[in-house]
């Protein structure tokens, strides 16, 4: 395979169909078949490759690999353990490779992944270990900075006997490895709630992405101690109203902005607080374009033109008056 | 119970060959790189060579690796060191290692006893 | 090829007192969250046996007696308090690169 260029121009390997025995470990600037190197930019592209596992023989100065576009179904423990260590490997992006189980420990040996993708793929089995590594109820600190998981719901019928928000979770919290993290990314991803302790145990966030899911509550969800977070996006969900916790809880973060578009806001008695906030917030990013999806008499009024006298509750009716 | 079990030491005049197995048994020996570490009379531990598990990655200690070739057979749970030109400095208790992890070796907790190869005229 | 080297070649230490062993790498086999050497314990007729991996982590089953330390080019293993049925020969492994390398050993003795 060819040597990389020295300029930041990308060489590349062609497949070849040499004796898949290695007698000796690659030569630190080789180029793995099928990718694109550039030692200048310390970047490897295999991408669109259909590659099933990550090549054996990355180059040691790799600092941005991209392994996007394959076929890489499971990606085991150690998946980039390698002697030496990837010790500069600092951005990982492997979205849309077909990923349907992350092992634990598989990112285990890169001490310096600041920036992790995996988005876009069907993730049927997210070990809770897979960002930890370890069992341990107390980890090492991960070194990750950023985590992209963006649309990694697999479809109904390929998903396990629980909770995919759950399992996410899961993977998030265990042994608090991930406490310096500031960026997490979420989106599009089918959750119906939020578990309640995800928040408080990731006390770095900056950057939330929550868009694109079914959201329909954030009674039993805290921002309380996201005391750094900068942006929470919302947009795209099925909240209702936030309640008056929820607005304290945001008005109270000192950098917030917050993204509410395009949720089926319920104009009734219980939306009255929340438009009072709306009115005097400067957190909300966009809150001229939050409208009414119900009810019908209220569809698309704008929230910040409403006032008390339009919220009004329909009385309950007592149960012999009700109609089914 | 991991067990690794040696076999095929024995007394070879020098420039002959032998072929070291290691049983395996306990595991999903399938799944493992392997690794034989060798240890001279009176003398330290060498790392000698060792194979990934689907045996398309194989490495050896330098000086080594002209003589010496590592095979596995997934279906007999069975590791190998073919040895060639054999030389009296190649006299040694002859390991077969197993990590605790499935990726690439960096410590080895499973050893087996140990077969002795004797190189001498 | 890295090498190890160990210090003192031999080293003979009262029951109940310290031991500490000496491995020196030719070069930097640390990152900044792993350091790449082991420990290992061999008694005669016997096969090696792990005592810590990653310099300090102690291998499961191993006493709390022993314990290692360091990084870069400067590893210990210390053994506290010694006791008789520590007679044995000790080693210390790279994993950094291809050919992994073992120290030259240490040979303990309890007086």
């Known amino acids: 395979s060819s040597p990389t260029s020295s300029a930041s121009s990308f060489s590349s390997s062609a497949p070849f169909l040499a004796s898949a025995v290695s007698a000796q470990p690659p030569l630190p600037d080789q180029c793995p078949a099928l990718c694109e190197c550039s030692e200048a930019a310390r970047t490897v592209k295999c991408v669109n490759r259909n590659l099933t596992e990550v090549p054996t023989d990355l180059p040691a100065y790799v600092r941005n690999l991209f392994l996007t576009g394959n076929q890489l179904a499971v990606l085991p423990a150690g998946a980039f353990a390698r002697r030496p260590p990837l010790a500069e490997l600092a951005a990982l992006n492997l979205s849309g490779s077909r990923l349907d189980e992350v092992r634990a420990g598989a990112f285990e040996h890169l001490p310096s992944l600041r920036q992790l993708d995996l988005s876009h793929n069907p993730l049927a089995d997210l070990s809770p270990f897979a960002f930890s590594g370890s069992n341990a109820s107390v980890s090492a600190p991960s070194p990750l900075v950023e985590l992209i998981l963006n649309h990694i719901v697999p479809p109904e019928d390929e998903r396990q006997n629980r909770s995919f928000e759950g399992m996410v979770v899961a993977a998030l919290l265990a042994g608090r490895a991930l406490q310096g993290l500031r960026r997490l990314e979420l989106a599009s991803n089918h959750f119906l709630y939020l578990p309640r302790d995800v928040l408080a145990q990731l006390p770095s966030l900056r950057h939330l992405d929550l868009s694109n899911n079914s959201l329909v509550s954030l009674t039993y969800v805290s921002f309380r101690n996201l005391t750094h977070l900068e942006s929470l996006h919302l947009e795209d969900n099925a909240l209702k109203v936030l309640h008056n916790g929820t607005l304290a809880e945001l008005q109270g973060l000192p950098h917030i902005r917050v993204f509410l578009d395009n949720n089926p806001w319920v104009c009734d008695c219980h939306m009255a607080d929340m438009v009072t906030w709306l009115k005097e917030t400067e957190v909300v990013q966009g809150k001229d374009r939050l409208t009414c999806a119900y009810p019908e008499k209220m569809r698309n009024r704008v929230l910040l033109e409403l006032n008390s006298a339009d919220l009004d509750c329909d009385p309950i009716l007592p149960p012999s008056l009700q109609t089914s | 119970e991991v067990q690794l079990l040696e076999s095929g030491g024995g007394l070879v005049q020098p420039g002959g060959s032998l072929r070291l197995s290691c049983a395996a048994s306990?595991?999903?020996?399938?799944?493992?790189?392997m690794t034989w570490v060798r240890q001279a009379p009176g003398k330290g531990l060498e790392w000698v060579s060792e194979?990934?598990?689907?045996?398309?990655?194989?490495n050896y200690t330098p000086s080594l690796k002209d003589r010496f070739t590592i095979s596995r057979d997934n279906a007999k749970n069975t590791l190998y060191l073919q040895m060639n030109s054999l030389r009296a400095e190649d006299t040694a208790v002859y390991y077969c290692?197993?990590?605790?992890?499935?990726?690439?070796?960096?410590?080895?907790?499973?050893w087996g006893q140990g077969t002795t190869v004797t190189v001498s005229s | 090829d890295i090498v190890l080297t160990q210090s003192p070649a031999s080293l003979a230490v009262s029951l109940g007192q310290r031991a500490t062993i000496s491995c020196r790498p030719s070069q930097s086999v640390s990152t900044s969250s792993n350091s790449y050497i082991h420990w290992y314990q061999q008694k005669p007729g016997q096969p090696p046996k792990l005592l810590i991996k990653?310099?300090?982590n102690l291998e499961s089953g191993v006493p709390a007696r022993f314990s290692g330390s360091g990084s870069g080019t400067d590893f210990t293993l210390t053994i506290s308090p010694v006791e008789a049925e520590d007679t044995a020969t000790y080693y210390c492994q790279q994993s950094w690169e291809i050919p992994l390398t073992f120290g030259g050993g240490t040979k303990l003795e309890i007086k």
């Open positions: 990653y310099a300090s």
């Open positions: 290692a197993r990590p605790d992890h499935d990726y690439n070796p960096y410590y080895f907790n499973y």
């Open positions: 194979i990934n598990p689907d045996s398309r990655t194989i």
């Open positions: 306990g595991f999903d020996f399938s799944r493992y790189w």
